[in-house]
Interface confidence: medium
Amino acid sequence: QLLEPCGYIYPEFPVVQRGSNFTAICVLKEACLQHYYVNASYIVWKTNHAAVPREQVTVINRTTSSVTFTDVVLPSVQLTCNILSFGQIEQNVYGVTMLSGFPPDKPTNLTCIVNEGKNMLCQWDPGRETYLETNYTLKSEWATEKFPDCQSKHGTSCMVSYMPTYYVNIEVWVEAENALGKVSSESINFDPVDKVKPTPPYNLSVTNSEELSSILKLSWVSSGLGGLLDLKSDIQYRTKDASTWIQVPLEDTMSPRTSFTVQDLKPFTEYVFRIRSIKDSGKGYWSDWSEEASGTTYEDRPSRPPSFWYKTNPSHGQEYRSVRLIWKALPLSEANGKILDYEVILTQSKSVSQTYTVTGTELTVNLTNDRYVASLAARNKVGKSAAAVLTIPSPHVTAAYSVVNLKAFPKDNLLWVEWTPPPKPVSKYILEWCVLSENAPCVEDWQQEDATVNRTHLRGRLLESKCYQITVTPVFATGPGGSESLKAYLKQAAPARGPTVRTKKVGKNEAVLAWDQIPVDDQNGFIRNYSISYRTSVGKEMVVHVDSSHTEYTLSSLSSDTLYMVRMAAYTDEGGKDGPEFTFTTPKFAQGEIE
């Protein structure tokens, strides 16, 4: 048994550039030839335990065999040289691992950053994958002095072991080396102070101003290498519920500062702020954002009065009427604070007025049949809104002027209403709507529109396949005009049930069918037409179409003494629904006819 190998493969540590050719040789020792009665022609080459085809093998002399590989692509191959001892037993002589890859590319995009409080970190693009063990070394020097090399663990970045010296330029480059070659990046020359990324500003606080409801004052603490650097700031803000940030113009925060007043904000609104900083020259890197801080602007008086309307309950036989004044709570954007109460002033003549302070959104008062003026203002802790004024005319006054060409239509899942204004200047419009139902009262919702509006959508939560009665009333300085109403659907559906048909009169050859209109709760849309299907037990089905305004129809040309089956369907724009089937029999003889 030989302890030493029978021979060797050269090169012993082969590294090949991908796509190139490669030749290895196996040299057998003389002692091995004699021991096993072999020569180089007995050598079998294998890659990863598979025999190499003979055409790739050359016997150079009695001790030496070569193998050639073309276009090497596998990253790692186990190459072994084996002999057929005594001409038949395969025995391993030697083995090597053949690696393939690429020489390193020249590193590019070398950049360095000094994170405040840490050493300098440089990063680069190593280029294409080498598939080989490749060492990247970050080199740095002053004009007169070299700094310790930085050996990269990841091949794309390295943090130097020394603290940077500011206000002195440094030269930095990267060297890359593997078994196939060595290359250097372009060097970069810079002052580390121009590569600083400050720590984020901290202790950001937000305070409001009682004097100005449109501002918030920010203050914060900046680091800037312990005051060594002057920093400029970048401030962003958003309302509490928004997802996008609003940018304070950078030119407003260019000078070093630790406080700032943000203007043009909405009253009584919560804002969230964040801030970051950079060297005031703009060189270096922006810090990460600070922790967010929030603050709420101070209240301002409500920016407009509430929508204001009234409903009258006539009191017959009495000297006064009950009037329900109603208004809408202001949206936050107009309330500008917490609404404490509403002030209603009712005036019957210049000398008689009554003031009410109301916390809710309605007030019922008793008025005589005279003309009244009602004014309404909303109040928060800063002050009162302007007043909305309504004239409540005498019930004996007939309302003149109404809107014309009133239309309603669904679009984009909203119910739109449009009209042509009356010929007299309008103060505002009131839209009222409710679901028409035979099972429940029409509970009205309402909204107010400015005088300039003649197209809007209903702003309540509307239901599909419900019939809405919509009323539009123009309001003038002298009081409400005439009201115009129509019916509309947000979205129609097929009726919930079809009509129940019956016979009103049956003759020998004709029958008068009658039916009731489908209740509005089951219509689910505008009934456009009906179809009447009728047949005998053996005959073909006949269908007639009837306009939706009808509630009866005469079937003619019927056979006498015959059983007929009838069914009706009602159709909306979205489809139809059959009612129950009904049967009747025509008589054998007409009235007064004898067999």
Epitope: E319, Y320, S351, V352, S353, Q354, Y356, V365, N366, T368
Partner: nanobody, 125 residues
Framework: QVQLQESGGGPVQAGGSLRLSCVIS????????MGWFRQVPGKEREGVAA????????VYADSVKGRFTISQDSSKNTVYLEMNGLKLEDTGMYYC??????????????????WGQGTQVTVSS
């Protein structure tokens, strides 16, 4: 329930003064006008003066203008009638009343829903 309680009536010499008070309690509805009315036996109850509790506006019968003053103290839910220069024809039962109706006709008794029991004023020579 609503209760109105008058006080301050009594005998007085012609040309003298009296101050009537009316306390209202149990009023869940916001009253609009408080009024003073008087009635002489055999005659209809007539309006003397009224005050709007919210606006403070006042109305007087022609016969008392310049002599009588109506006022209120909302913190005490009380209405007062200050009567100066009393005349013999001012004698009668004085009633306090509350109305929920806003109107310049506020001494029209038909508009008042709530009434007190009355306090007697007697003017003698």
């Amino acid at each position: 329930q609503v209760q109105l309680q008058e006080s301050g009536g009594g005998p007085v010499q012609a040309g003298g003064s009296l101050r009537l008070s009316c306390v209202i309690s149990g009023f869940t509805y916001r009253q609009t006008f408080m009024g003073w009315f008087r009635q002489v036996p055999g005659k209809e109850r007539e309006g003397v003066a009224a005050i709007s509790t919210g606006g403070g506006s006042t109305v007087y019968a022609d016969s008392v203008k310049g002599r009588f003053t109506i006022s209120q103290d909302s913190s005490k839910n009380t209405v007062y009638l200050e009567m100066n220069g009393l005349k013999l024809e001012d004698t009668g039962m004085y009633y306090c009343a509350a109305s929920t109706v806003i109107t310049s006709e506020s001494i029209n008794r038909g508009l008042y829903q709530y009434w007190g029991q009355g306090t007697q004023v007697t003017v003698s020579s």
